[in-house]
């Protein structure tokens, strides 16, 4: 009945509703049917959120912060539904809401505790800073403060730097990890305990490849089954690092099954893509193709980074010409 938020029953006519920032929610309240229905929703026992009586809304005294954001299920009132439809919740809306329902038979009050969470999709980035390599797990907007854990080769790491900036309604968090010289795999997990939502970033470095000029190279990129769910929307991006910045070679969007290729020598095997294998080929290698190649598979719940180092060496003919 209440599809836009999940709520937990707790004692004493009190329920907890968990909403997401900027989404719509329903604060539930029901009563025994009766004539002359009066409904008053209040926030923190002080601010008028919504009033209904004598068959219509009376919003003259409504607190301005709720203007055009609340409504009742008018066709359901006679069936005992006093629930409040609440549009675009913000973190300032968190708190206790009291629903007063009176009829000619009885008066009841229900309390609803609204908690609001934020979890904008995090990202895992691979960065070069001078001679150092960093993995950075970051989330632009999150509330409440998340739990961030790092693992190296599936073993938890205690070292966990967190750069945190707080705004009025959420936190922005960066968690960098220096992985210079490491061949290990790394995993970063960001958990929002309120929204019961977890995101995982996984980074794997493949063995370096040595290729001759004019040859082609095949670089593997297959998602780990633990995270990957093919019926969930995701994006695959192949990019190459040049002078500290990545340039995109190609990307694939699962929602539209679209492939966009920016490098004419790049090829993707459509049949492999259909089997969730995003390995790529780069033809006709030249010396400037040496570098790091990054495959990024990302969805709302994970980012899987696979990095390949390619060394392109001059072919014998090129060497003899010199």
């Amino acid at each position: 009945i209440f599809p836009l938020a999940f709520f937990i029953y707790v004692p004493m006519n009190e329920q907890i509703v968990i909403g997401r920032l900027d989404e719509d929610i329903i604060l539930p309240s029901s009563f025994e049917r009766g004539s002359e229905v009066v409904i008053h929703w209040k926030y923190q026992d002080s601010y008028k959120v919504h009033s209904y009586y004598k068959g219509s809304d009376h919003l003259e005294s409504q607190d301005p912060r709720y203007a055009n954001r609340t409504s009742l299920f008018y066709n359901e009132i006679q069936n005992g539904n006093a629930s409040l439809f609440f549009r675009r919740v913000s973190l300032l809306d968190e708190g206790i809401y009291t629903c007063y329902v009176g009829t000619a038979i009885q008066v009841i009050t229900n309390k609803v505790v609204l908690k609001v969470g934020v979890f904008l999709t995090p990202v895992m980035k691979y960065e070069k800073r001078n001679t150092n390599s960093f993995l950075i797990c970051s989330v632009l907007s999150v509330y409440p403060r998340p739990i961030i854990t790092w693992k190296m080769d599936n073993t938890p790491i205690s070292e966990n730097n967190m750069e945190e900036t707080g705004s009025l309604d959420s936190f922005s968090i960066n968690s960098p990890l220096n992985i210079t010289g490491s061949n290990s795999s790394y995993e970063c997990t960001i958990e929002n305990s309120l929204l019961k939502q977890t995101w995982t970033g996984r980074w794997t470095m493949k063995d370096g490849l040595h290729k001759m000029q004019s040859e082609h190279v095949s670089l593997s990129c297959q998602p780990v089954n633990d995270y990957f769910s093919p019926n969930q929307d995701f994006k695959v991006t192949w990019s190459r690092m040049k002078s500290g910045t990545f340039s995109v070679l190609a990307y694939y969007l699962s929602s539209s099954q679209n492939t966009i290729i920016n490098e004419s020598r790049f090829s993707w095997n459509k049949e492999l893509i259909n089997q969730s294998d995003f390995s790529m080929n780069l033809m006709d290698l030249n010396l400037s193709d040496s570098g790091e190649y990054l495959c990024n598979i990302s969805s709302d719940e994970y980012t899987l980074l696979t990095i390949h180092t390619v060394h392109v060496e001059p072919s014998q003919e090129t060497a003899s010409h010199n």
């Epitope: 002359e36 009066v38 008053h40 209040k42 009586y53 004598k54 008066v107």
Partner: antibody
Framework: QVQLVESGGGVVQPGRSLRLSCAAS????????MHWVRQVPGKGLEWVAV????????DYADSVKGRFTISRDNSKNTLYLQMNSLRVEDTAVYYC?????????????WGQGTLVTVSS | DIQMTQSPSSLSASVGDRVTITCRAS??????LAWYQQKPGKVPKLLIY???TLQSGVPSRFSGSGSGTDFTLTISSLQPEDVATYYC?????????FGPGTKVDIK
Amino acid sequence: QVQLVESGGGVVQPGRSLRLSCAASGFTFSNYGMHWVRQVPGKGLEWVAVIWYDASEKDYADSVKGRFTISRDNSKNTLYLQMNSLRVEDTAVYYCAKDLISGIYYVDHWGQGTLVTVSS
Amino acid sequence: DIQMTQSPSSLSASVGDRVTITCRASQGISNYLAWYQQKPGKVPKLLIYAASTLQSGVPSRFSGSGSGTDFTLTISSLQPEDVATYYCQKYNSAPFTFGPGTKVDIK
């Protein structure tokens, strides 16, 4: 059963003040609106004031606006009427009355009343 | 503010008679009208609300009708215990004004 007992009435001079109280029992006081209604002996009923269940709204008859203040203490189950600048024409029996619901309906229970006499 | 008038201001009727009292509002008040009975020396008692709904415990000889501006209270068969003053009250919005009352007695 609902019981409303008014007190605080008496004889007072014009221009003076008086505070009426109404002790409520037999129902959840904090859930209901409350009214004061007055009646000059031998005359008709005159609605004086209403206060919502949570005291968030109050309304007054034009004849008492600015002079009378209705209030309530839900923790004490008590309704009040503070009457200032009393006039001879305020002489009446003052009834405390319970609203059907929150303070926007009719009176469904009445107290016995307390007599206020304004006289020099 | 909306004014309430009642007619007649008083009436005498015989036991068993049908008695009708009229209440008029100066502006429409939908069906937000209540009727009260006040017997001599007693406090008022609610008879009818929402213009036509009988309060529980009130004898069925009392009935109410009307909507908008014109309302009536009818006693289908007057009884000695019905001697009282009857008041209408509007409650669509404050001020919740009473009518001036109609005094009913037995001939």
